[in-house]
């Protein structure tokens, strides 16, 4: 056979569909690989051919389009299953060709089973709702093209295993599910079951998504530096280890790049001739607000290091802040205080200087 532009196995489109439900799968060539659409290709005399490789087999075989009730069919650039069976799992290839041109791509299709509570190995899309933000909606996804607009399907919504009816703040509205006001308690998996008739048969489409309630933009603030702060003095003797944590709170902001960094005398720590290490840790609240901590560490600090300026900087889409740490060299108790103490017949040992918080 003549050469064919082979786009290989398109693993980015790990298509998962439920067993015993309709599935319509568009040939990825026109969506992601070629610069023209199916109509243009068809007008130019190109033919779209489908074949597949069963799971755990190497043999490519044609797709049987002569099954009872047209269980598998092709329409333009779409491969239809009405409905799927478990053993439809495999790698599917669509090839566009004529006598002078050929291009093909394969993609994996996995038919998965679900239990009565809609639990399955299906990867679930995540929809973020803002906490206490007013009315927000989610829409039953990936149901376009399954039935004509003249058909009026029935849609039933579930949270987890439970049908949504008489919920306080969640109202089914056909293809939409409205949250009058979202709370943390609304976190969870939501399923819509779309039931529609076709040629005397009844089909069901099951779509599950995860709702995650996150911080609201109306409550979002610029980064807040909790440490260093004005109440803590980092007082060290030369030779001791200096540890300064920079702890920053970031409000949840969609697609914000949250940054924390230290400067020493206005420069990057690595540009200063001292052995500095920085360890970062990140934690998230239930609403995905973020706390980042960067601990600046100098194993054996010198008197020169104790004169430097250590500034923690933080930045998000909401703004930028900076805070200097108060670093001092510990002053040894003067000799005369010891002599005075002896002179007055004191029995206790002399104490060092006191600080608000000592690190």
């Amino acid at each position: 056979s003549e050469r064919c532009d082979d786009w290989g196995l398109d693993t980015m489109r790990q298509i998962q569909v439920f067993e015993d439900e309709p599935a319509r799968i568009k040939c990825p060539l026109f969506e992601h690989f070629l610069k023209f659409n199916y109509s243009t290709a068809h007008s130019a005399g190109l033919t779209l051919i489908w074949y597949w490789t069963r799971q755990d087999r190497d043999l490519e075989e044609p797709i049987n389009f002569r099954l009872p009730e047209n269980r598998i069919s092709k329409e333009k650039d779409v491969l239809w299953f009405r409905p799927t069976l478990l053993n439809d799992t495999g790698n599917y290839t669509c090839m566009l060709r004529n006598t002078t041109y050929c291009s093909k791509v394969a993609f994996p299709l996995e038919v998965v089973q679900k239990d009565s509570c809609f639990n399955s190995p299906m990867k679930l899309p995540v929809h973020k709702l803002y906490i206490e933000y007013g009315i927000q909606r989610i829409t039953c996804p990936n149901v376009d093209g399954y039935f004509p607009s003249s058909v009026k399907p029935t849609i039933t919504w579930y949270m987890g295993c439970y049908k949504i009816q008489n919920f306080n703040n969640v109202i089914p509205e056909g293809m939409n599910l409205s949250f009058l006001i979202a709370f943390i308690s609304n976190n969870g998996n939501y399923t819509c079951v779309v039931t529609y008739p076709e040629n005397g048969r009844t089909f069901h489409l099951t779509r599950t998504l995860t709702v995650k309630v996150v911080g609201s933009p109306k409550n979002a603030v610029p980064p807040v530096i909790h440490s260093p702060n004005d109440h803590v003095v980092y007082e060290k003797e030369p030779g001791e280890e200096l540890l300064i944590p920079c702890t920053v709170y970031f409000s949840f902001l969609m697609d914000s790049r949250n940054e924390v960094w230290w400067t020493i005398d206005g420069k990057k720590p690595d540009d200063i001739p001292i052995d500095v290490t920085i360890n970062e840790s990140i934690s998230h609240s239930r609403t995905e607000d973020e706390t980042r901590t960067q601990i600046l560490s100098i194993k054996k600090v010198t008197s020169e290091d104790l004169k430097r300026s250590y500034v923690c900087h933080a930045r998000s889409a909401k703004g930028e802040v900076a805070k200097a740490a108060t670093v001092k060299q510990k002053v040894p108790a003067p000799r005369y205080t010891v002599e005075l103490a002896c002179g007055f017949g004191a029995t206790g040992s002399g104490s060092g200087s006191h600080h608000h918080h000592h690190h």
């Epitope: 790049r257 949250n258 940054e259 960094w261 990057k268 720590p269 690595d270 840790s281 930045r315």
Partner: antibody, heavy 119, light 107 residues
Framework: EVQLLESGGGLVQPGGSLRLSCAAS????????MSWVRQAPGKGLEWVSA????????YYADSVKGRFTISRDNSKNTLYLQMNSLRAEDTAVYYC????????????WGQGTLVTVSS | DIQMTQSPSSLSASVGDRVTITCRAS??????LNWYQQKPGKAPKLLIY???SLQSGVPSRFSGSGSGTDFTLTISSLQPEDFATYYC?????????FGQGTKVEIK
């Protein structure tokens, strides 16, 4: 002396995969965010992806989202770019670069590795 | 995404000339603007960060200015080794974006 050394480039067919590596030395690797930037033959610079020092946050250009994955192994001082579903337009020299923070820019770059996507 | 527009796209100059390259951002980027120099077959090199701060080891004939949307890179007295392509880049938000480049050629 800061050094960044990319490897893993080469010729790959459309739809294929490649994994680029960037070996870092001369600085405290885990302190720094790292980026991949590419340059198609005769064209300008295009940022591809970035990862924070801890590896906890990743960022991608829309043109590679869902196809490329950036990661790092701080114990090996190595940055990676896993490239799947490669297209002809991904043909470029790929550079890794280090960044203390966005304020300081991409202050050191590797010499680049060429990725050619062609059938 | 923030678009970065450089001008001119190329210029011819002589050794000793004062050269100015401008860069405009499609929205305010504060001072998150960096300048890079790239020579054929080589990796880019950071010259200026934060709009006006000179990167360590870069000659003082290079300077940067501007904030918000309009920025300038100036080479006070062009040297033979300065003939190269110069790129501006915003690091205000991801995706990081570069200008299309300005090629400085020998007159």
């Amino acid at each position: 002396e800061v050094q960044l050394l990319e490897s893993g480039g080469g010729l790959v067919q459309p739809g294929g995969s490649l994994r680029l590596s960037c070996a870092a030395s001369g600085f405290t690797f885990s302190n720094y965010a790292m980026s991949w930037v590419r340059q198609a033959p005769g064209k300008g610079l295009e940022w591809v992806s970035a990862i924070s020092g801890s590896g906890g946050s990743t960022y991608y250009a829309d043109s590679v989202k869902g196809r490329f994955t950036i990661s790092r192994d701080n114990s090996k001082n190595t940055l990676y770019l896993q490239m799947n579903s490669l297209r002809a337009e991904d043909t470029a020299v790929y550079y890794c670069a280090k960044e203390w923070s966005s304020y300081f820019g991409l202050d050191y770059w590797g010499q680049g590795t060429l990725v050619t996507v062609s059938s | 995404d923030i678009q970065m527009t450089q001008s001119p796209s190329s210029l011819s100059a002589s050794v000793g000339d004062r050269v100015t390259i401008t860069c405009r951002a499609s929205q305010s980027i504060s001072s998150y603007l960096n300048w890079y120099q790239q020579k054929p077959g080589k990796a880019p090199k950071l010259l200026i960060y934060a709009a006006s701060s000179l990167q360590s080891g870069v000659p003082s004939r290079f300077s940067g200015s501007g904030s918000g949307t309009d920025f300038t890179l100036t080479i006070s007295s062009l040297q033979p080794e300065d003939f190269a392509t110069y790129y501006c880049q915003q690091s205000y938000s991801t995706p990081l974006t570069f200008g299309q480049g300005t090629k400085v050629e020998i007159k």
